[in-house]
């Protein structure tokens, strides 16, 4: 009983004056609270609370469920308590089967006893199964049995409170422990796409997936450098115990250019935070940008192959692509493919394969591409390098020797005189006249060069060589001279092609 100090308010006194009282089932409970400022009696057991404004608490026929703590409170807020056990051999436990434990914390199995004098008050596994080896508990007859430091592995553990009564083990109703996980890692966050490219007015929708051990993980979409609350929609899943997933979908129904920017999906729990970003670019209209992968001026040798390659960015997706030469569209010999299989890819490659090009196939090759918004084109100027070909080699009526050669690049014509029967013509002869015949035309075909020398300069038998050459190769034509007296006999031209 409390000691009384004069002048200070004192707690109420209770009769009978003991901390615990044991009564048998069916007996009377009579508790008297003595205090000039009596306010109420309160009864508590498990989650149940009852009040009584009478200073004497009387229960005529006690039941096991009357087991609990009886507290008398006065007007000063001071109180005193007595715990009553109502011994009922048929009901040794009062139970609240709801059993939740937070990982790494203690949790109470609420099975208070109605008889404090039973022995071996403990926990047992259901159906004779042993409890986990590391499970520690502390029994308290008035409250239940406290499981210390709950482990995640105890989730869904089935157990009973147990006592020994007259040498026999008595079990309570079963309890199923539900463990609430502690956060021991940051949430896992991912985003449906890392970047989005849209035209004005199109819908922007992006989904963030947040994974954690429980639904109490926090998540939100944020716009970088902005405090505006974004509109999100959610879905959630429990993929079994300790495996929770939330999807947060952010939508802008009609995106504008100024919506462009970086959006962050942020998630945190008591352990830490994680985030992932996605970039939105909104353009007022679509575009196509073409990048040649080779020089747009191409030189290729006669009979060789060349690939004309472009990369291009197209948004929205390209709808029509074509390669054109001399107003004709290629139906084959070309391929067009996306640069990557990535869903957000906007870069494409187009290749035109030109094989065994002839000298007549030089010219402008044009790649055209279009989408729903724009058209674009790029031109390649292809020059076919050809070895000179001597078209004519004649003695003109005015006594001139004339050589006409065609090739690309423009051939150079040199003249040589070989006296007598020598095979090597080393003495060079300067031409009288050199003309490029078709330089005014398109610069893709062969260039024709005409060169003339005066045959009157030759006084001896011999051979005159006309040699046409360029970067690709050389070709020669020969004029034979024979003198009879002072007269030149016929000139016999013949050619010798030198590779």
């Amino acid at each position: 009983q409390p000691s009384v100090s004069p002048g200070e308010p004192s707690p109420p006194s209770i009769h009978p004056g003991k901390s615990d009282l044991i009564v048998r089932v069916g007996d009377e409970i009579r508790l008297l609270c003595t205090d000039p400022g009596f306010v109420k009696w309160t009864f508590e057991i498990l989650d149940e609370t009852n009040e009584n404004k009478q200073n004497e608490w009387i229960t005529e026929k006690a039941e096991a469920t009357n087991t609990g703590k009886y507290t008398c409170t006065n007007k000063h807020g001071l109180s005193n308590s007595i715990y009553v056990f109502v011994r009922d051999p048929a009901k040794l436990f009062l139970v609240d089967r709801s059993l939740y434990g937070k990982e790494d914390n203690d949790t109470l199995v609420r099975c208070p006893l109605t008889d404090p004098e039973v022995t071996n008050y403990s926990l047992k596994g259901c159906q004779g199964k042993p409890l986990p080896k590391d499970l520690r508990f502390i029994p308290d007859p008035k409250a239940g049995i406290m499981i210390k430091s709950v482990k995640r592995a105890y989730h869904r553990l089935c157990l009973h409170c147990s006592v020994d009564q007259e040498g026999k083990s008595v079990l309570s109703e079963k309890f199923i422990l539900k463990v609430r996980p502690a956060f021991k890692a940051v949430p896992v966050v991912s985003v449906s796409k890392a970047s989005y490219l849209l035209r004005e007015g199109e819908e922007f929708t992006v989904t963030c997936t947040i994974k954690d051990v429980s639904s109490s993980v926090y998540s939100t979409w944020k716009r970088e450098n902005s405090q505006t609350k974004l509109q999100e929609k959610y879905n959630s899943w429990h993929h079994g115990d300790f495996n929770y997933e939330r999807q947060a979908t952010l939508t802008i129904s009609s995106a504008r250019v100024n919506d462009s920017g970086v959006f962050m999906c942020y998630a945190n729990n008591t352990f830490g935070s994680a985030n992932v970003t996605t970039t939105l670019e909104v353009v007022d209209k679509g575009f196509i940008n073409i990048f040649p992968m080779i020089n747009t001026t191409v030189f290729v040798n006669d009979g060789e192959n060349v690939d004309l390659i472009v990369e291009y960015e197209a948004f929205p997706k390209p709808e029509h692509q074509q390669w054109i030469y001399m107003n004709r569209t290629f139906t084959d010999k070309w391929e067009d493919y996306p640069k990557s299989e990535n869903e957000s890819n906007i870069r494409y490659v187009s290749e035109l394969h030109l094989t065994r090009l002839k000298g007549t196939e030089g010219g402008t090759y044009t790649f055209l591409v279009s989408n729903s918004d724009v058209n674009a084109a790029i031109a390649f100027n292809v020059y076919v390098n050809t070895k000179p070909e001597i078209l004519t080699y004649d003695r003109l009526v005015n006594g001139m020797l004339q050589c006409v050669a065609a090739g690309f690049p423009e051939p150079t014509i040199d003249w040589y005189f070989c006296p007598g029967t020598e095979q090597r013509c080393s003495a060079s002869v300067l031409p009288v006249d050199v003309q490029t015949l078709n330089s005014s035309g398109p610069p893709f075909g062969k260039l024709v060069v005409q060169s003339s020398i005066d045959s009157s300069a030759f006084k001896h038998n011999g051979t005159v060589e006309c040699k046409a050459y360029n970067d690709v190769g050389k070709t020669s034509a020969y004029f034979n001279f024979a003198f009879k007296g002072n007269n030149k006999e016929q000139i016999h031209p013949h050619t010798l092609f030198t590779p």
Epitope: T220, Y234, H238, G240
Partner: antibody, heavy 119, light 107 residues
Framework: EVQLLESGGGLVQPGGSLRLSCAAS????????MSWVRQAPGKGLEWVST????????YYADSVKGRFTISRDNSKNTLYLQMNSLRAEDTAVYYC????????????WGQGTLVTVSS | DIQMTQSPSSLSASVGDRVTITCRAS??????LNWYQQKPGKAPKLLIY???SLHSGVPSRFSGSGSGTDFTLTISSLQPEDFATYYC?????????FGGGTKVEIK
């Protein structure tokens, strides 16, 4: 004692709007997720929407997505359901219910309020 | 969305009978299953949560079992006040869905 009291039901024309309220007492609204569940005349229960304890997360049935908005005013301990673009098939008794937490089911329900959508 | 199928849709039984109602989910919902009782003109009441846990204040004649896709509500000895409609509901993933209900009538 936990109590939930719905109000705001009534007759509304198709395409119209209505706001249902659910006044909660006996517990703190912020500690619990709250849901709306409806029951068409003579039919079974249909989950409509749930809002988390913080109010940060809202979930909707496909049939009401984009038309209904769940919200809460924790200072007034009140849950709301704003219903727009109402259709005849939205006619039902609407119940608000408390989620007992940790996905343990809806442990307390209001008495329901009838919404009739008809021209 | 997860579909919940209850069977039977109705049954007739007598006081004292053992009654079993089943609920099947269209995909794995682990133990995220709740059972409710509803009487005409009244709001539903939670009986069982987490497939097998008895809600406080619910008589112990009600029990639940199952996990994954197949679940059972059992009333061990039917009492007069148990004649009602029973619904299962999954809380594994949104949208949360109810079964079609089972009406328990007096034989």
């Amino acid at each position: 004692e936990v109590q939930l009291l719905e109000s705001g039901g009534g007759l509304v024309q198709p395409g119209g709007s209505l706001r249902l309220s659910c006044a909660a007492s006996g517990f703190t609204l912020t500690s619990y997720a709250m849901s709306w569940v409806r029951q068409a005349p003579g039919k079974g229960l249909e989950w409509v929407s749930t809002i988390s304890g913080s109010g940060g997360y809202t979930y909707y049935a496909d049939s009401v997505k984009g038309r209904f908005t769940i919200s809460r005013d924790n200072s007034k301990n009140t849950l709301y359901l704003q219903m727009n673009s109402l259709r005849a098939e939205d006619t039902a008794v609407y119940y608000c219910a408390r989620d007992s937490g940790y996905d343990r089911g809806l442990d307390y329900w209001g008495q329901g309020t009838l919404v009739t959508v008809s021209s | 969305d997860i579909q919940m199928t209850q069977s039977p849709s109705s049954l007739s039984a007598s006081v004292g009978d053992r009654v079993t109602i089943t609920c099947r989910a269209s995909q794995n919902i682990y133990t995220y299953l709740n059972w409710y009782q509803q009487k005409p003109g009244k709001a539903p009441k939670l009986l069982i949560y987490d497939a097998s846990s008895l809600h406080s204040g619910v008589p112990s004649r009600f029990s639940g079992s199952g996990s994954g896709t197949d679940f059972t509500l059992t009333i061990s000895s039917l009492q007069p006040e148990d004649f009602a409609t029973y619904y299962c509901q999954q809380s594994s993933s949104t949208p949360y869905t109810f079964g079609g209900g089972t009406k328990v009538e007096i034989k």
